[in-house]
């Protein structure tokens, strides 16, 4: 912590200006009004203070506003938005989409995912929900950003808003992720035709149930391996040699690339090695012939 | 050991039919489509079609679709490519090979002469 | 039916270079071709499949790259064993055609 002094007459700052470069960081705490510098904060950022020098500027703001910075502060952070913690971010309240970009910016080619993620909590929490305009800001700015919410912020996006979303937009989305914008998805692209409906449900698929996976399996889609690696393990497992094959169509030949991997390697292990035989692919592991399968968890669920 | 073994060498008169044959061992022969490629002196390699042990699908190129013939023996273990009507362009050495491409047999010369 | 136009059709190189051989498919086969090399009098060897998996026993210094339509194989510091003719093949459906061949000669 700055030690506290009292400001040279000579030091003491009436506005925030370039001068203030040469000023030691207990000078900046002795000689800089909390509140002038909240109302000066659009001249910060051009000023080529030393990281030092920020952290004393953020001491101040962070004394003047204990509950969290008001919007006008935010929106002029710059570069102090890099000495931010996601503790610090958790206390404001942000729902101007210029604040958003110009934070997003900032923070570009800085280790910072954590504090992004929390800023665009806070934006959807301050906007009531995750709308069009926020969702356009998010992929033009930070791809990959939409996948740093919770799924529970992730369940106010309307349906209407998912068309908006991009392929790349959804690669670092988790399961739960996916299971709460799949559904919204099928809402949002039902009146497509087959094929234009699965070029766009594809990105959400890691999110869709069995009987959705089974239904794509009877429209020849031909699904890349790729997107069925990100299927869910539940959703795959209930699938026949039959369905699977004419799920992949022709990228069934990937299923050998990947016989060692979930969710491919606990599919075979549940298929007739008779019925893996089918494909030709040379896959292995699959219940022997001759063997009985007992379903134990049907005498389970009715005990 | 796991190999794919074929006669080395067939010699057949012009119009004549023959039937090449691939015995699979040290491996799963149902669970692998097996492959025919074919391969004239000097010149690159041609897929001519592949059968699959197991259903007995076969997939042919439309190019010797009229004239090939793919087959299999299970309970041998053997694969059977017969050609018919055979003319000069026949003559080449014949591959099998099994799907995954790990696997290719020694190549039968087939030589059609009178 | 898929078309694989592959190039340079032949290419002489000495022992310790680097080459590169490329395969250009007629249309998107994602990452299924695989590279074969092929010694006079001799059955093809398979050397990657899956664009740039290693088939078990062959060389590192052999490595595939590529998707979709576009694929290379480069082999570094080239071994006296190394020449010969080198083919890709697609393996997305059938008909499963092959490019032309790349023979490898010494310089």
């Known amino acids: 912590d700055v030690e506290r002094t009292t400001c040279p007459p000579e030091k003491e700052v009436h506005e925030i200006d370039e001068s203030l470069i040469f000023y030691k960081k207990r000078e900046l705490e002795a000689c800089v009004d909390a509140a002038l510098l909240a109302a000066q904060m659009d001249r910060v950022d051009a000023i080529p203070f030393t990281y030092e020098q920020l952290d004393v500027l953020k001491h101040k703001l962070d004394e003047l506003y204990p509950q969290g910075y008001p919007e006008s502060v935010i929106r002029h952070l710059g570069h102090l938005f890099l000495k931010m913690s996601p503790e610090d971010i958790r206390k404001w309240n942000v729902t101007s989409l210029e604040t958003l970009k110009a934070l997003l910016k900032v923070s570009k080619g800085h280790e910072m995912s954590a504090q992004v993620a929390t800023l665009i909590d806070r934006v959807v929490v301050g906007r009531g929900q995750l709308d069009k305009d926020t969702v356009d800001t998010l992929t033009a700015f930070c791809p990959g950003c939409l996948c740093s919410l919770s799924p529970e912020r992730l369940s106010s996006v309307p349906p209407s808003v998912i068309g908006a979303v991009r392929p790349q937009d959804l690669d670092t989305c988790g399961p739960r992720q996916l299971d709460v914008l799949y559904p919204k998805a099928r809402l949002a692209f039902q009146n497509m035709s087959g094929s234009e409906y699965f070029v766009k449900i594809r990105p959400f698929l890691g999110g869709a149930p069995t009987e959705d996976v089974k239904a794509l399996s009877q429209q020849n889609v031909s699904m890349d391996l790729a997107t069925f690696m990100k299927l869910r393990r539940e959703a795959v497992l209930p699938l026949t040699v039959a369905e699977v094959q004419k799920l992949l169509g022709p990228h069934v030949e990937g299923l050998k690339v990947e016989e060692q991997h979930s969710p491919v390697r606990d599919w075979i292990l549940k298929q007739r090695q008779d019925d893996l035989d089918t494909l030709g692919l040379g896959l292995q592991g699959g219940i022997p012939n001759g063997y009985l399968i007992l379903d134990l968890s049907v005498r389970e669920a009715l005990s | 050991q796991v190999q794919l073994q074929q006669p080395g060498t067939e010699l057949v008169k012009p119009g004549a039919s023959v039937r090449l044959s691939c015995r699979a061992s040290?491996?799963?022969?149902?669970?692998?489509?097996m492959h025919w490629v074919k391969q004239r002196p000097g010149q690159g390699l041609e897929w001519l079609g592949n059968i699959n042990p197991t259903t007995g699908d076969i997939n042919y190129n439309e190019k010797f679709r009229n004239r090939a013939t793919l087959a299999v023996d299970k309970s041998s273990t053997t694969a059977y490519l017969q050609l018919t009507s055979l003319t000069s362009e026949d003559s080449a050495v014949y591959f099998c090979?099994?799907?995954?491409?790990?696997?290719w047999g020694q190549g039968t010369t087939l030589t059609v002469s009178s | 039916d898929i078309q694989m136009t592959q190039s340079p059709a032949s290419l002489s190189a000495s022992v310790g270079e680097t080459v590169t051989i490329t395969c250009r498919a007629s249309e998107n086969i994602y990452s299924y071709l695989a590279w074969y090399q092929q010694k006079q009098g001799k059955s093809p060897q398979l050397l990657v499949y899956?664009?740039?998996t290693l088939a078990e026993g062959v060389s590192s210094r052999f490595s595939g790259s590529g998707s979709g339509t576009q694929f290379s194989l480069k082999i570094n510091s080239l071994q006296p064993e190394d020449f010969g003719t080198y083919y890709c093949?697609?393996?997305?459906?059938?008909?499963?055609?092959f490019g032309g061949g790349t023979k490898l000669e010494i310089r």
């Open positions: 040290g491996y799963s022969f149902s669970s692998y489509w």
């Open positions: 090979v099994r799907h995954d491409g790990f696997l």
């Open positions: 899956y664009a740039k």
């Open positions: 093949q697609h393996q997305f459906g059938t008909p499963r055609t």
